[in-house]
């Protein structure tokens, strides 16, 4: 069945019982997210207006799909899977009378089924699964899911701490030929290729066998430790870099006044906290950004966004994803992605991998 | 590449029966929901029955609620429409169209077969 | 039960005009709203999905907009080919259409 392709998920509750106040409905709705996005990598926020991924609506009789509500009784809401439009929708029968306790049906308990349905589950077999095809009250302050119901979700969307690199422990320097070593992020810089990790980068000069290891904060003080993404565009002498919802400018290798800004100034919904990955390709003058399984394109000419993304990494990029750490383009035909230990070299002319490498190869190691 | 081919149009009396198939090939048709659109000549577009994947819920417009069947064999990747008792309004061309959606129906047709005529008439 | 009430039925423009067609439900239906265009003899193509999602293939010169009981299709710049009838579609009912004619 289907699943959602990316890991922030945003759901709106377009309209509230009278049954229970405002504030009783919202914390109902979050914490039955929260069940799941205890046991998966999922991140779930509410928004209030716009369009979110799953619309939460109390509603009866006929209500805009061909699954009327019952009145009383009977079915009591329903969910479509993952997709777009009404895809991921949860429809609670307002006929019903919702409550915060044991009385009439409880929202937060019919709301965890729901938001499975949503997330792509289907009815299980077990009758102490929250799954389970009928309501039956179970105390709310001990419920948990059970273990069906953790196999299915984390089936579809892996366990929690799955895509969440483990920072370096002690924060002591990298052994640079470690297999397993990986980036967190990678960029062209003139003739260099700076290579971040940590508190640390590298410095490859290109074609040299040289390679030295520095403190980003002795190069850069007023910058932070971990950046995430960085791109360059050359013919501009700008380097940009990411970490978290912020990005720092640095122009001829000097930190510009007035940064950090928000990543939201470039378009992205708020839903996004972090870019993975970025680059730019001086070819089209465009800026990819790649966020969880997904990748932005951004002119930097027109300064915004290009229309009709995101769009899925694996989707565009044949061989590639579903999530990257690193990528810098380089030879006016390569980007060079990074994956955990592994580098793919992918001609973006020919729209293929054409080198799989170990992400240290370009130390001599 | 989707397609959808309607067959077993014609000309048919009043009171008469009919069945329509709706051959669907270059997707998964198991997983989705169907549904059969009509046109009457010179009208606008009706919705007369959808089905769930596994052949059930069916729904059915009012206007042929207790003539018209919907059905489905997944084994053949075939969509059915069993008419009976038509009258002169069920003259129209006959659509099958795929939802975008399994499980539940969302009421959202992407694809649609070219359609077959159906006339009631003596 | 919901009905769905689109205007105008018919309308005459001509190639580069901007053109507007709504469509309005009798209750709520949030963003559950779909147009199709039909070219005579042909079977209806989907345009516009979920009030405003464009279609993929469909050009950029269509748009959809609203949500609740009012909805729009606008069609930005119109070209020789946009000449057909346009329907909007909610669930099981669908408005009753719009001839976009040549002027």
């Known amino acids: 069945g289907p699943v959602w392709r990316k890991h922030y998920i945003t759901y709106r509750i377009n309209n509230y019982t009278p049954d229970m106040n405002r504030e009783d409905v919202d914390y109902a709705i979050r914490k039955a997210f929260q069940v799941w996005s205890n046991v998966t990598p999922l991140k779930f926020s509410k928004i209030n207006t716009g369009m979110a991924d799953i619309l939460v609506v109390f509603a009866r009789g006929a209500h805009g799909d061909f699954h009327a509500f019952d009145g009383k009784g009977g079915i009591l809401a329903h969910a479509f899977g993952p997709g777009s439009g009404i895809g991921g929708d949860a429809h609670f029968d307002e006929d019903e009378f919702w409550t915060t306790h044991s009385g009439g049906t409880n929202l937060f308990l019919t709301a965890v089924h729901e938001i499975g349905h949503s997330l792509g589950l289907g009815h299980s077999s077990d009758p102490k699964a929250v799954m389970f095809p009928t309501y039956k009250y179970v105390d709310i302050n001990t419920f948990r899911l059970s273990a069906d119901d953790i196999r299915g979700i984390q089936s579809l969307y892996g366990d929690p701490k799955e895509n969440q690199r483990l920072p370096n422990p002690d924060n002591s320097e990298p052994a640079l030929c470690d297999p397993n070593l990986s980036f967190d992020a990678v960029t062209t810089v003139g003739n260099k290729i700076f290579f971040f990790k940590d508190r640390f980068f590298w410095l490859k000069v290109s074609e040299r066998p040289k390679t030295s290891v520095n403190l980003i904060s002795s190069l850069w003080p007023t910058l932070p430790s971990g950046i995430e993404a960085a791109y360059e565009i050359e013919a501009r002498n700008q380097v940009f870099l990411f970490k978290d919802d912020k990005y720092w400018l640095i122009s001829n290798l000097r930190p510009e006044p007035n940064y950090p800004k928000s990543i939201h100034s470039f378009g992205f919904p708020n839903f996004v906290k972090k870019i993975d990955a970025a680059v730019f390709n001086p070819r089209f003058y465009r800026t990819y950004f790649f966020v969880d399984n997904q990748y932005w394109r951004y002119d930097e000419r027109r300064q915004m966004m290009d229309p009709g993304y995101p769009k899925l990494i694996t989707k565009n990029f044949q061989g590639i994803g579903p999530k990257i750490d690193a990528v810098f383009y380089s030879k006016n035909k390569y980007y060079y992605f990074f994956q955990g230990s592994n580098q793919f070299e992918y001609d973006f002319l020919l729209q293929r991998i054409t080198k799989t490498l170990k992400s240290n190869s370009w130390f001599g190691c | 590449e989707v397609q959808l081919l309607e067959s077993g149009g014609g000309l048919v009396q009043p009171g008469g029966s009919l069945r329509l198939s709706c051959a669907a090939s270059g997707f998964t048709f198991s997983p989705y929901w169907m549904h059969w659109v009509r046109q009457a000549p010179g009208k606008g577009l009706e919705w007369v029955s959808g089905i769930g994947p596994s052949g059930g819920p069916t729904f059915y417009a009012d206007s042929i609620k207790g003539r018209f069947t919907i059905s489905r064999d997944n084994s053949k990747n075939t969509l059915y429409l069993q008419m009976n008792s038509l009258r002169a309004e069920d003259t129209a061309v006959y659509y099958c169209?795929?939802?975008?959606?399994?499980?539940?129906?969302?009421?959202?047709?992407?694809?649609w077969g070219r359609g077959t005529l159906v006339t009631v008439s003596s | 039960d919901i009905q769905m009430t689109q205007s105008p039925s018919s309308l005459s423009a001509s190639v580069g005009d901007r053109v507007t067609i709504t469509c309005r439900a009798n209750q709520s239906i949030y963003t559950y709203l779909n147009w199709y265009q039909q070219k005579p003899g042909k079977a209806p193509e989907l345009l516009i999905y979920a009030a405003s999602s464009l279609q993929s293939g469909v050009p950029s010169r269509f748009s959809g907009s609203g949500s609740g009981t009012d909805f729009t299709l606008t069609i930005s710049s119109l070209q020789p080919e946009d000449f057909a009838t346009y329907y909007c579609q909610q669930a099981g009912i669908f408005g009753q259409g719009t001839k976009l004619e040549i002027k």
């Open positions: 169209a795929k939802d975008i959606r399994g499980a539940y129906s969302s009421g959202l047709f992407d694809y």
